[in-house]
């Protein structure tokens, strides 16, 4: 898979790690550090944004410590001397668990997201454009370090108030009738950002397509719900969407909607209270006739993980669950390219979305 942005990612780098940030830090640059906290040795790890490889000049030292109940130290080192520590007495990381750590460089500060949630702001103490190196050390194993350049035009999520000049931002802020879910949105107006990963293919197993738009992947341990994003280019024959997640143990229902403007072209609605998978279309706020037939038993189970494939074809959508075809849904809204928004809500935790 190819990561978007101007700099190639560092894949599975050995720790301790030091690597160049090509072009240095820029306003709007987003750097994602994805890895797992080691469960055994050590009680600390650190991510440093520094000048050169010596470690004497560190613009931002981000240092989770599994000590004294757990806390995170942020600091700056100039000419070998540390400044005053800023401590956050909340530990968003867990030993032995994977994490997705995003650093967004902005004119006044670094914004740090852990697993998609704004964790801390660290105001610049030295000019950030001096930074040309990222280093990681301590009790951590890395999967990748990726770079999202602000000049890269990403997919713009539906209902986002963030202008296109910003990096891709998730979750989008809902407008209008959609209610703000508790505990997800940061108090300040800064966007929560998330890395967008482009893969080479535009559909499963597809090397050529028209239009040739690569799928967007949003790799994250957990997503805010409801999750809303645009489908770049809308639907077209051979376009596929892959979602995975876990059904909550007490789940009643969840839904996956493919939308066109105010219409819901495809409403996929597993209902645990009815032991059914309901499919329908809503046009101008009016629901059509439901489709419920299944070739086998209800594939979704409370408390269990699942994956859903939606494959668009000329006449229908094919839907597979856990890699096995489940049903077809013949298009009721036939202007496929206008079906360009994905909405997911209800009693699940999303773990992977690829559009």
């Amino acid at each position: 898979m190819a990561f978007s942005g101007s700099q190639a990612p560092y894949l599975s780098p050995a720790v301790p790690f030091s690597g160049t940030i090509q072009g240095g830090l820029q306003d709007g640059l987003q750097i994602t550090v994805n890895g797992t906290v080691l469960s055994s040795s050590g009680t600390r790890f650190a991510v440093n944004f520094q000048t050169g490889f010596s470690g004497n000049d560190i613009a931002f030292h981000f240092n989770p410590r599994f000590e004294d109940g757990g806390y995170v130290v942020c600091n700056t080192r100039q000419n070998g001397s540390w400044g005053p520590e800023e401590r956050k007495t909340h530990m968003p990381f867990q030993k032995g668990m994977p994490f997705d750590l995003c650093f967004l460089v902005q004119s006044s500060d670094f914004k740090v997201m852990v697993n998609g949630i704004l964790f801390v702001q660290y105001f610049h103490r030295v000019p950030f454009h001096r930074v040309d190196t990222i280093s990681v050390n301590g009790s951590v194993q890395l999967s990748y370090i990726s770079f999202q350049n602000p000049r890269t035009v990403p997919v713009q999520p539906a209902f986002s108030t963030v202008p296109f000049s910003q990096p891709v931002c998730f979750p989008p802020r809902p407008r209008g009738r959609r209610q703000k879910p508790p505990g997800v949105w940061p108090a300040n107006p800064a966007p929560i950002t998330q890395t967008v990963i482009h893969t080479v293919q535009s559909a499963p197993g597809q090397m050529f397509s028209t239009p040739a738009i690569p799928p967007m992947m949003y790799p994250h341990p957990a997503y805010p719900m409801p999750f809303i994003t645009t489908i770049l280019g809308g639907l077209y024959p051979s376009k596929s969407i892959l979602l995975s997640g876990t059904v909550l143990p007490s789940a009643q229902r969840f839904h996956i909607n493919l939308c066109s403007g105010n219409h819901i072209a495809f409403h996929l609605n597993p209902r645990f209270d009815e032991n059914a998978v309901v499919r329908n279309t809503q046009i101008d706020n009016s629901w059509g006739s439901e489709e419920r037939s299944l070739p086998r038993k209800m594939p979704f189970v409370r408390g269990q993980s699942f994956s859903v494939w939606i494959l668009c074809e000329a006449h229908c959508l094919k839907v597979a669950v856990d890699g096995q075809h489940l049903f077809e849904y013949y298009h009721r809204l036939r202007n496929l390219p206008t079906i360009n928004r994905l909405e997911v809500g209800g009693d699940i935790q999303l773990t992977h979305v690829q559009t």
Epitope: M1, T199, V200, Q201, P204, G205, M217, L242, S244, P295, Q304, S305, S307, W309, L311, K318, A320, D322, G323, Q324, H325, H352, Q354
Partner: antibody
Framework: EVQLVESGGGLVQPGGSLRLSCAAS????????IHWVRQAPGKGLEWVAA????????TYADSVKGRFTISADTSKNTAYLQMNSLRAEDTAVYYC??????????WGQGTLVTVSS | DIQMTQSPSSLSASVGDRVTITCRAS??????VAWYQQKPGKAPKLLIY???SLYSGVPSRFSGSRSGTDFTLTISSLQPEDFATYYC?????????FGQGTKVEIK
């Protein structure tokens, strides 16, 4: 680029064991079924086994049930076929293939297993 | 288990010919049938999925159809690169059986 690379084939005596590996890259391994399909010399394709790495769900052809075990390591993006109590009729080129929900869309180059004394 | 009976086992044809290969499922498999092409010494390639859907990048001269439990692969105008062996596979339920294969040879 999607790639599947098989390894581990070779010559083994009847009753012996062999473990085949299928290293996958270029796609989200855990959300695709991985299938093993074999082809005896000059014969047709025979489906052997499959696994869905995300849930560890497995399924086997009757001819290998109880003798072969399919497994996957999602941290390594690799599927395995452990073959025990091998027989002469297990001699074949073994392919691993990616199971897109509607077909086997990518295949490895195959690895030859020869069971002979 | 579902048996897939493929016919003919081999056929000879010329460039430009229309070629039809059939697979009959021993029981209902809905439309969960795929067709593959294999050339000597090479791995198979997916041509058709869901009985009649053309896989991406496959030339449009290949098509598939279904009538009950009978599935047909048609090559509308045979090209030199189409001489190969073709297999059907049912993907309705495990074990995911293949047909015996049809070898398309040059007349």
């Amino acid at each position: 680029e999607v790639q599947l690379v098989e390894s581990g084939g070779g010559l083994v005596q009847p009753g012996g064991s062999l473990r085949l590996s299928c290293a996958a890259s270029g796609f989200t391994f855990r959300y695709y079924w991985i299938h093993w399909v074999r082809q005896a010399p000059g014969k047709g394709l025979e489906w052997v086994a499959a696994i869905f790495p995300s849930g560890g769900i497995t399924t086997y052809a009757d001819s290998v049930k109880g003798r072969f075990t399919i497994s996957a390591d999602t941290s390594k993006n690799t599927a395995y076929l452990q073959m025990n109590s091998l027989r002469a009729e297990d001699t074949a080129v073994y392919y691993c293939a990616r199971g897109w929900p509607w077909g086997l869309d990518y295949w490895g180059q195959g690895t030859l297993v020869t069971v002979s004394s | 288990d579902i048996q897939m009976t493929q016919s003919p086992s081999s056929l000879s044809a010329s460039v430009g010919d229309r070629v039809t290969i059939t697979c009959r499922a021993s029981q209902s498999v809905s439309s969960a049938v795929a067709w593959y092409q294999q050339k000597p010494g090479k791995a198979p390639k997916l041509l058709i999925y869901s009985a009649s859907s053309l896989y991406s990048g496959v030339p449009s001269r290949f098509s598939g159809s279904r009538s009950g439990t009978d599935f047909t692969l048609t090559i509308s105008s045979l090209q030199p690169e189409d001489f190969a062996t073709y297999y059907c596979q049912q993907r309705d339920r495990s074990p995911y059986t293949f047909g015996q294969g049809t070898k398309v040879e040059i007349k």
